[in-house]
């Protein structure tokens, strides 16, 4: 006899990285027929929703209108069908950004490199933080964590064309409170070692696209946005 129901999926819309004072919705997707959903924050009950009619709804949304550092942390959800409860969802790490200051991201030897060249990113922030995060734009984006008093180095090693993309960095005041994002730096990698020049390009990153990428887990799993429930656990644990 089954003692628990399958765990629900949990994710944040539009993104798990939320600028302070902006809104975010935490979504929990269980099964049709669930009569109650509970959202837990840092291990304690945070909110409850009872969908009506339960047989036609398999997802609930918990709305946070004004993100701040007190709301940042780890969320999970469970649901109930009759008297039977589900396993808890994976943890959702909700991060508040745009806290305090803006770091500077730089790249050596430059934004245009040849495949095989050693590339290092540097994230610098003069205020009180010692953890830095380097993020690459994209649906299967890579995240690196680095440490330093005012600057962290992120050596990518000899690069390939797979390293092409737009990078930003953050200073982290704790696991769930991050600085403003740095200006973007676009890395262009040419695969032909003979072709050692590229037309100059001014890296741009439209502000409205910053929230559109997702982060892969350690397994590199990629899911549809609606089913995403792993939100950079490799980064935050």
């Amino acid at each position: 006899q089954q003692q628990t129901l399958p765990k629900p999926f949990i994710w944040a819309e539009p993104h798990f990285m939320v600028p302070k004072e902006k809104q975010v919705t935490i979504c929990c997707q269980g099964n049709y027929g669930a009569v109650e959903y509970q959202l837990h924050f840092e291990g304690s009950l945070f909110a409850v929703d009872r969908p009506k009619p339960p047989e036609r709804i398999n997802k609930v949304q918990f709305y946070i209108p004004d993100m701040n550092s007190r709301m940042a942390g780890q969320y999970s959800c469970i649901y109930r069908v009759g008297e039977l409860w589900s396993e808890p969802s994976n943890l959702l790490d909700l991060v508040v950004t745009e806290m305090y200051d803006t770091p500077t991201l730089s790249v050596h030897p430059g934004p245009e490199v040849i495949s095989g060249e050693k590339v290092t990113f540097y994230c610098r922030l003069d205020t009180a933080t010692s953890m830095f995060l380097l993020l690459k734009e994209g649906r299967s984006s890579h995240v690196q964590r680095g440490y330093g008093k005012v600057q962290a180095e992120f050596p990518l090693g000899p690069v390939t064309t797979a390293h092409r993309g737009t990078y930003r960095c953050f200073g982290s005041y704790n696991n769930h409170a991050w600085s403003f994002p740095s200006e973007p730096v676009k890395l262009l990698v040419t695969g032909d070692i003979e072709n050692t020049s590229l037309a100059p390009e001014d890296p741009t990153f439209p502000a409205d696209t910053w929230g559109t990428y997702l982060l892969t887990t350690e397994t590199g799993l990629q899911k549809d946005h609606a089913l995403w429930d792993h939100t950079a656990q490799n980064l935050l644990r």
């Epitope: 050596h108 050693k118 740095s182 100059p200």
Partner: nanobody
């Protein structure tokens, strides 16, 4: 004390050649970059060379005309400039381990004082 000193600039007619030198002293570097800055314009990347690997990279505007090289024994980096054009007129700077910071801005802890190159038509 770390020092980068450029030399070799001057006045040359269009189509002519010049060789710029950058003397690096005080420590070892991973890369040496050449930049240039024309009056009223932003500093622009020209070429770079890795000190050990000798890998080179050029801006599209100078590829095929300029050649960067280095002499380990003398701690010198050279920029051989051929088929010069009036639009190559600028102050040329060398920099060590320069880093790009976005929006066409570059930073380095070590810059030379610059050498003027003027190409007349």
């Amino acid at each position: 004390d770390v020092q980068l000193v450029e030399s070799g600039g001057g006045l040359v007619q269009a189509g002519g050649s010049l060789r710029l030198s950058c003397a690096a002293s005080g420590r070892t570097f991973n890369t040496i970059h050449w930049f240039r800055q024309a009056p009223g314009k932003e500093r622009e990347f020209v070429a770079r060379i890795w000190w050990i690997e000798r890998t080179t990279f050029y801006a599209a505007s100078v590829k095929g005309r300029f050649t960067i090289s280095r002499d380990n024994a003398k701690n010198m980096v050279y920029l051989q400039m051929n088929s010069l054009k009036p639009e190559d007129t600028a102050v040329y700077y060398c920099a060590a381990d320069a880093r790009y910071t976005g929006s066409r801005r570059w930073e380095s802890d070590y810059w030379g004082q610059g050498t003027q190159v003027t190409v007349s038509s």
